[in-house]
């Protein structure tokens, strides 16, 4: 379809780099959530940091190209990196408007499919880009 994809846009304070240039921020009449219309893909992404007690959103926005996973209708995150001991970054890609607003589910920390404690370690800023 020719219509462009629109995604939720968010970048947590302290996250290095930005995906803002991958789209055009929209005026939605409300402060949050912000919306971004993708320029180079029809695909949204989301990154959440899962610790023992909670999941915290790190980034949401547009991908720079359509890749495997972008055909998903919903955000089904998968584990990607360990920014620090006891926390895991989960990412999703999906291809419907605002599909990255929230995830359908997150596996509990340490469950099958989650990288073990010996998984890749990264400095806080770098871990986001590893996840992307």
């Amino acid at each position: 379809p020719p219509n462009r994809r629109t995604c939720v846009f968010f970048e947590a304070p302290g996250v290095r780099g930005s995906t803002k240039t991958l789209g055009e921020l929209l005026d939605t009449g409300t402060e949050l959530p912000r919306a971004i219309r993708c320029l180079y893909s029809r695909c949204c992404f989301g990154i959440w940091n899962l610790t023992q007690d909670r999941a915290q959103v790190e980034m949401q926005g547009c991908r720079d190209s359509d890749e495997p996973g972008c055909e998903s209708l919903h955000c089904d995150p998968s584990p990607r990196a360990h920014p620090s001991p006891g926390s895991t970054l989960f990412t999703c890609s999906c291809g419907t408007d605002f599909c990255n607003a929230n995830y359908s589910h997150l596996p509990p920390p340490g469950s099958p499919g989650t990288p073990g404690s010996q998984g890749p370690q990264a400095a806080p800023g770098e871990s986001i880009w590893m996840a992307l």
């Epitope: 629109t6 240039t21 055009e24 005026d27 939605t28 893909s41």
Partner: antibody
Framework: QVQLQESGPGLVKPSETLSLTCTVS?????????WNWIRQFPGKGLEWMGY???????SYNPSLKSRITISRDTSKNQFFLQLSSVTAEDTAVYYC??????????WGQGTLVTVSS | DIVLTQSPSSLSASVGDRVTITCRAS??????????MHWYQQKPGQPPKLLIY???NLESGIPARFSGSGSGTDFTLTISSVQPEDFATYYC?????????FGGGTKVEIK
């Protein structure tokens, strides 16, 4: 300041391939932006042909999709247009343009390409 | 493809006149209340020059006598008091849907 300059043959024979180069100065084509080709027919109508993005992905006008290729040489900060099987209807002024958003803020001066035997 | 129809195709004006050009789209060019319609000015032998983006935002360096308005399918470019350097051809462009398309142009001539 972003500057763009088109270059290439001004005359192409029918059925051959039109090849143009856009040289970008003042900005790296891998930093940001979509790098577009737009043409203007003798009747003054404008047509967006396609782009190559800073990351190398491409998007083409479906009306040209079977004939158009846009590529780049990042070491020379250039991007290219190839349009195959040209006819007289492809005679136009060809512009390269840079766009941070979905409108075109930066344009080259344009180069006239005539398709004729 | 979205077809953009500009009217009039040409007009004559005197310096100081208020000039209004319209652009009608074959379908809405809005996304969640944001209008993806843009306006350009072109003089002979030059490339188009961006004037207005997203319906009503004035590009940096463009005089305030230029303004844009509209939403959905109907858009207007207004020159509040036309100056000698404004005699040119004006184009609208939509970017709400691929492929991007342009209007046929409106030539503003000196009366």
């Amino acid at each position: 300041q972003v500057q763009l300059q088109e270059s290439g043959p001004g005359l192409v024979k029918p059925s051959e391939t039109l090849s143009l180069t856009c040289t970008v100065s003042g900005y790296s084509i891998t930093s940001d932006f979509a790098w577009n080709w737009i043409r203007q027919f003798p009747g003054k109508g404008l047509e967006w042909m396609g782009y190559i993005s800073f990351s190398g992905s491409t998007s083409y006008n479906p009306s040209l999709k079977s004939r158009i290729t846009i590529s780049r040489d990042t070491s020379k900060n250039q991007f290219f247009l190839q349009l195959s099987s040209v006819t007289a209807e492809d005679t136009a002024v060809y512009y390269c343009a840079g766009s941070r958003y979905s409108w075109f803020a930066y344009w080259g001066q344009g180069t006239l390409v005539t398709v004729s035997s | 493809d979205i077809v953009l129809t500009q009217s009039p195709s040409s007009l004559s004006a005197s310096v100081g006149d208020r000039v209004t050009i319209t652009c009608r789209a074959s379908e809405s060019v809005d996304t969640y209340g944001n209008s993806f319609m843009h306006w350009y000015q072109q003089k002979p032998g030059q490339p188009p020059k961006l004037l207005i983006y997203r319906a009503s935002n004035l590009e940096s360096g463009i005089p305030a006598r230029f303004s844009g308005s509209g939403s959905g399918t109907d858009f207007t470019l207004t020159i509040s008091s036309v100056q000698p350097e404004d005699f040119a051809t004006y184009y609208c462009q939509q970017s709400n849907e691929d492929p991007y398309t342009f209007g046929g142009g409106t030539k503003v001539e000196i009366k």
